[in-house]
Amino acid sequence: SWMWNQFFLLEEYTGSDYQYVGKLHSDQDRGDGSLKYILSGDGAGDLFIINENTGDIQATKRLDREEKPVYILRAQAINRRTGRPVEPESEFIIKIHDINDNEPIFTKEVYTATVPEMSDVGTFVVQVTATDADDPTYGNSAKVVYSILQGQPYFSVESETGIIKTALLNMDRENREQYQVVIQAKDMGGQMGGLSGTTTVNITLTDVNDNPPRFPQSTYQFKTPESSPPGTPIGRIKASDADVGENAEIEYSITDGEGLDMFDVITDQETQEGIITVKKLLDFEKKKVYTLKVEASNPYVEPRFLYLGPFKDSATVRIVVEDVDEPPVFSKLAYILQIREDAQINTTIGSVTAQDPDAARNPVKYSVDRHTDMDRIFNIDSGNGSIFTSKLLDRETLLWHNITVIATEINNPKQSSRVPLYIKVLDVNDNAPEFAEFYETFVCEKAKADQLIQTLHAVDKDDPYSGHQFSFSLAPEAASGSNFTIQDNKDNTAGILTRKNGYNRHEMSTYLLPVVISDNDYPVQSSTGTVTVRVCACDHHGNMQSCHAEALIHPTGLSTGA
C-alpha cells in the first residue's frame, strides 16, 4: 500500500533550488530500483517533477495560493521489468499554504457620498469595503481593519465594518461643503507588519434649510403713475438665502401697511425676486404715498431648526403715486333711462354726471356723439348733463336708443371720456288694432240667415305683444238695417254672419261692411276696417261658381248699404 498523507507547500518560495514537496513511497519498494514512480495530474512534469526511482517530488516554480490553492495529482508505482502496477493508481492532494502576500484592496478607488449638513454626530455617511486575497481561514493575513488617515475630526470610520460616520456637531454646508477623507484598510488585524491599502472618499454636505431669507436693505422705494392698471409691475425686491435649491426658495407677501389692499407681491420663480404689482386702481388725488410691510419667507421649513429663529424677514416698501392728467369720470359705467313714447319735444329723460378726477377739478362740458344719434332725436345740456328729447318718439319704430355721451374737460379738450346711454322707449297705447289681413269674402245667393261667411282677426302694434283684448262691432252708420251681423267671439276674433235668407246679385252684387275694432287698453284705441262681401252664384254644396267680375273692376257705384 501507499505510504503518504496530503502534502503542504508554502507559497511564494524564493529559494535557489527546487522546493521539496514530499515523497511517494510504496511498501513494495525494496530499494533495489525495481519500481518506477510515475506522476500525473495538475502540473505533473511541469510544476511538479518526481524522481522515478526515489519517489521524491519537487516544485519547479514559485507557486501562488491566490492563483491556485490546491493541486490534485495521481501516483503510480510499476514494476520496471514487467511494466505492471505494484500499487493501484492513487489520487493525492498538494495544498498550497498561505503567506501574507496580498494587501487589502478597496472595491472603489474613489467613493463619493453625501450627508446632510448639521447632522447629528454618528450619522451614517457611506460604507467602504476592502477585500484581501489571502486565506481568511488561516491566520490574520486576510483580517482587515479600517482606520481614517485624513478627514478627522469631521468623520470617523468603524474599524470592523468600514462604515463612515459624522464625527463633528453642526457641520455647516455654508462654511464648507466638500471633504476628502482617506481611509486605510490593513490586514493582520491591523498589527505591525500587516499590509494596507487606501481609498479616497469625497463627501459633500447636502443643504438643509438652516438659514432664513434676509433682505439686504430694510427700506425700498418705488414710483408708479396713478394710471397704472391692475397687474402693472412697479418694482422688484430680493431677499437672499444662504441655502440652495428648494431651501432657498422664497415666498413674498404683504403683511401690513396702508397699501395692503392696493398692491400685490408675486414671486418670480426664476429669479426668486418679489415683484410688487398694482392690485387696485390708484388715485393720486386720494392718496399719494403708500407704505407696505413685505415679508420674505421660506415655504419649506424644517421644524428642528426653528430654534434658530423665524425663517422670514421683512422690509418696508414705500410707493409714491405720481399724478397723471386724467379724463373726466362718469358716475356710472352706463346709464339706463326710460321715456314714454308720447313724450313732448324737450322732455327731460334724465341726466349724466362726470367729474375731472384730478386735483385741479377742471370743469367739464357734455355732448352727444352724433354718430350714435344721427337723427338728432336726443340732446344734452352741455353744462348740467340733462338729456332731453329733440324729436317725437315712436316705440313701435324703435324700442331702444343706444347713444353715447361725451364729457370733455373745458380747459383741456384732449381729455374726454365716453359713456353709453341706453334709452328705453316705454309703450303708450297709441296704435289702434286693425285687421290682420285684407278681407274679401263672398256670400251665396241662396245663403240662409245666421250663416258664418268669414272669421276676422286683428293685430295691434302696441304692447302687450300677445294678449290684447279686442272687441268687434259694426260701425254705427251700418248698424241699423244691415244685411249682415258681427258676432264678437270674445277671443280676439269675430264672425260675419248673414242676417237674411237669400241675396240677389243682380240687385246688389257687393256689400261693403265697416267693422270697428277696439282694444281694451288705455286710452282705448279703435279703427274701422272694411270687409268686402260679394254675392255669388253657388252650387248646392255652397261652392262659388260665378260672381260679377265688374264689381271688382269698377268700384264706383258700389253700394255700402251692408
Epitope: 302687450p464 300677445s466 294678449g467 283684448q469 272687441s471 277696439s518 286710452p523
Partner: antibody, heavy 116, light 107 residues
Framework: QVQLLESGGGLVQPGGSLRLSCAAS????????MSWVRQAPGKGLEWVSV????????YYADSVKGRFTISRDNSKNTLYLQMNSLRAEDTAVYYC?????????WGQGTLVTVSS | DIQMTQSPSSLSASVGDRVTITCRAS??????LNWYQQKPGKAPKLLIY???TLQSGVPSRFSGSGSGTDFTLTISSLQPEDFATYYC?????????FGQGTKVEIK
C-alpha cells in the same frame, strides 16, 4: 275662473296713507290693463286710475293726481294703489277691475274710511 | 270731462215687463259706451260694451243700442234677479265717466 281680491282698506286719519292690494288669478295678468274704480257710500261709480299691462304707463283722475300711485308686480299677479294725503272725500269702497276701457271683471271691493 | 246723464233715475216695474233705460253723453262718444248692473253690497257687473256687444254669460234679454250721444239699455222681459241699479260709462275719452245710475225697483 277670473278672480280679483282687494285688501288693505281700513280707517285712516286725514293726511294719512294707505296701500291697497289686488291679487289676481285665473287669467294672464301681465296681458291686461288694470284699473281702480271707487264708490262713495250711497253714491255712483268714479274711475280713479289705470295702469297698462307692462306697467309702463299710468293715468289718474284729476281728483287723485299727485296723491295716489298705481303700480303692479306682474311676477306676483298683484295690483297696488298707494294712497297718500288722504282726505275725507276719498272715503269709498275701492274696486280693482280688469280692463282699460270696459271693466269685464271686478273685485269685491275694500272700504277705505278717512276720518279724524 | 264728458257728462253722462241717465234717465230715469229710478223706475218701478213688474216681472215680465219690458224696461228701457237711456243714457245721454254731453258730446259724441261714437259707440264707446258700456252698461253695468250693480246689486246692493256687490261689485258692478259688465252687461254690454261697445254700445251693443253682449258680454259673455249675460242673458240675451239684455240688449244695447245707440251711437253718438244717445244710448239705450233694454231688458225685454224683466226677471226677479234684474232688480238692481244700472250704470252707463263712456270710454271715448279720458277721464272715463259714469252716469249717476238708474235704480230698477219692484212695482
Amino acid at each position: 275662473q277670473v278672480q280679483l281680491l282687494e285688501s288693505g282698506g281700513g280707517l285712516v286719519q286725514p293726511g294719512g296713507s294707505l296701500r291697497l292690494s289686488c291679487a289676481a288669478s285665473g287669467f294672464t295678468f301681465s296681458s291686461y290693463a288694470m284699473s281702480w274704480v271707487r264708490q262713495a257710500p250711497g253714491k255712483g261709480l268714479e274711475w280713479v286710475s289705470v295702469i297698462r299691462s307692462s306697467g309702463s304707463s299710468t293715468y289718474y283722475a284729476d281728483s287723485v293726481k299727485g296723491r295716489f300711485t298705481i303700480s303692479r308686480d306682474n311676477s306676483k299677479n298683484t295690483l297696488y294703489l298707494q294712497m297718500n294725503s288722504l282726505r275725507a272725500e276719498d272715503t269709498a269702497v275701492y274696486y280693482c277691475a280688469r280692463g282699460g276701457g270696459y271693466f269685464d271683471y271686478w273685485g269685491q271691493g275694500t272700504l277705505v274710511t278717512v276720518s279724524s | 270731462d264728458i257728462q253722462m246723464t241717465q234717465s230715469p233715475s229710478s223706475l218701478s216695474a213688474s216681472v215680465g215687463d219690458r224696461v228701457t233705460i237711456t243714457c245721454r253723453a254731453s258730446q259724441s262718444i261714437s259707440l264707446w259706451l258700456n252698461w253695468y248692473q250693480q246689486k246692493p253690497g256687490k261689485a258692478p257687473k259688465l252687461l254690454i260694451y261697445a254700445a251693443s256687444t253682449l258680454q259673455s254669460g249675460v242673458p240675451s234679454r239684455f240688449s244695447g243700442s245707440g251711437s253718438g250721444t244717445d244710448f239705450t239699455l233694454t231688458i225685454s222681459s224683466l226677471q226677479p234677479e234684474d232688480f238692481a241699479t244700472y250704470y252707463c260709462q263712456q270710454y271715448y275719452t279720458s277721464p272715463y265717466t259714469f252716469g249717476q245710475g238708474t235704480k230698477v225697483e219692484i212695482k
